[in-house]
Amino acid sequence: LIIGFGISGKHFITVTTFTSAGNIGEDGTLSCTFEPDIKLNGIVIQWLKEGIKGLVHEFKEGKDDLSQQHEMFRGRTAVFADQVVVGNASLRLKNVQLTDAGTYTCYIHTSKGKGNANLEYKTGAFSMPEINVDYNASSESLRCEAPRWFPQPTVAWASQVDQGANFSEVSNTSFELNSENVTMKVVSVLYNVTINNTYSCMIENDIAKATGDIKVTDSEVKRRSQLELLNSG
């Protein structure tokens, strides 16, 4: 969470941004809020990126002005125009690229004053893992797969019964480059699993952490997955 203050004569407004992460190839949002101003035509929103000449996006007089927009953002950005008057200057970013990572500035000018705040935007790839029983293996095995990760994550297995056990000797993890030559598919196989136990496959890089749980009993297989972004907010 970053709060910036701006001073315009005697006037300053608070601008707040949130550090966030973008998933390569998906659509993302760079969050920014400011003190509301009912005079829409008096609000100017400018998004800038460190090291880039030209603007990421500009919104003024109630509409976009993309005349100064940098080529790399062409056709990829939009503000939530109907939410500007209530203080939402967040930016939608289409088809997030690795090169979109960096420091952005959300600059606001309203009839109340000026203000700005920076945000750090990380880009990578992260996806939910899916664990299945691998019936093709010679012994009872679990296969954990996640389709898209970048940078290369670490993979670790854990068990509810054998808490603290090191499964690195009885597991095998591989990383397969996807067709766009950036993200990778993660596959990890855990061997010699026992029935009536809950196993967890944990995939983590510096952007996200994902966990897949599986419980295998005689009568059923229960699965659960979750994903959390790291260092956000």
Epitope: E26, D27, K63, D64, S67, G75, A78, K94, N95
Partner: antibody, heavy 120, light 107 residues
Framework: QLQLQESGPGLVKPSETLSLTCTVS??????????WGWIRQPPGKGLEWIGN???????YYNPSLKSRVTISVDTSKNQFSLKLSSVTAADTAVYYC????????????WGQGILVTVSS | EIVMTQSPATLSVSPGERATLSCRAS??????LAWYQQKPGQAPRLLIY???TRATGIPARFSGSGSGTEFTLTISSLQSEDFAVYYC?????????FGGGTKVEIK
């Protein structure tokens, strides 16, 4: 309501340059949230995006046509134009102009289209 | 470039019946997809954008769904004016590309 109208010659000789103009009425071409695009459709076939322009003059072209395409804008006349050089029979198509959202980038509305035949 | 594939090429449906049109992208386009309707001798008309948002003035019988690589346009109860060719278009990355179209004809 916003309307677009294509104009230009319906017949162009091979190796010459195809030139079309799109006139925008019922709204300003300087509306900030939109690009202005060209799309074509060969007879009985599908649609191909040619490229777009912003009112400030910045352009983006389909790489498959980039070496032959020029799109320009005249804000004083509320018009934008397409030039396609070194045409062949494969460029025979109905050419449409359309307003293109800056994002989302859907095309709406479209001009009625103009059939351009490349033939000697 | 992203290749858009539509199926079937032709769909024969009786008036009042449901029509389901498919569009597949060669790679994920998130929800950055639009659907258009084109009648003979006319320009295409925008029906859906953002994969599922109906354009202004489009009847509720038209609905879009899907994300990533698989998309569907559903016409819940075909009216006589709905018999036309339908195109999907991705605007996820340049160059924007269209599918080959699905012709919906009277059975």
């Amino acid at each position: 309501q916003l309307q677009l109208q294509e104009s230009g010659p319906g017949l162009v000789k091979p190796s010459e340059t195809l030139s079309l103009t799109c006139t925008v009425s019922g709204g300003s071409i300087k509306s900030g949230s939109y690009y202005w695009g060209w799309i074509r459709q060969p007879p009985g076939k599908g649609l191909e995006w040619i490229g777009n322009i912003y009112y400030s003059g910045s352009t983006y072209y389909n790489p498959s046509l980039k070496s032959r395409v020029t799109i320009s804008v005249d804000t004083s006349k509320n018009q934008f134009s397409l030039k396609l050089s070194s045409v062949t029979a494969a460029d025979t198509a109905v050419y449409y102009c359309a307003r293109e959202g800056s994002y989302p980038n859907q095309f709406d509305p479209w001009g009625q289209g103009i059939l351009v035949t490349v033939s000697s | 470039e992203i290749v858009m594939t539509q199926s079937p090429a032709t769909l024969s449906v009786s008036p009042g019946e449901r029509a389901t049109l498919s569009c597949r992208a060669s790679q994920s386009v998130s929800s950055n997809l639009a659907w258009y309707q084109q009648k003979p001798g006319q320009a295409p008309r925008l029906l859906i954008y953002g994969a599922s948002t109906r354009a202004t003035g489009i009847p509720a019988r038209f609905s879009g769904s899907g994300s990533g690589t698989e998309f569907t346009l559903t016409i819940s109860s075909l009216q006589s004016e709905d018999f036309a060719v339908y195109y999907c278009q991705q605007y996820h990355s340049f160059p924007f590309t269209f599918g080959g179209g699905t012709k919906v004809e009277i059975k």
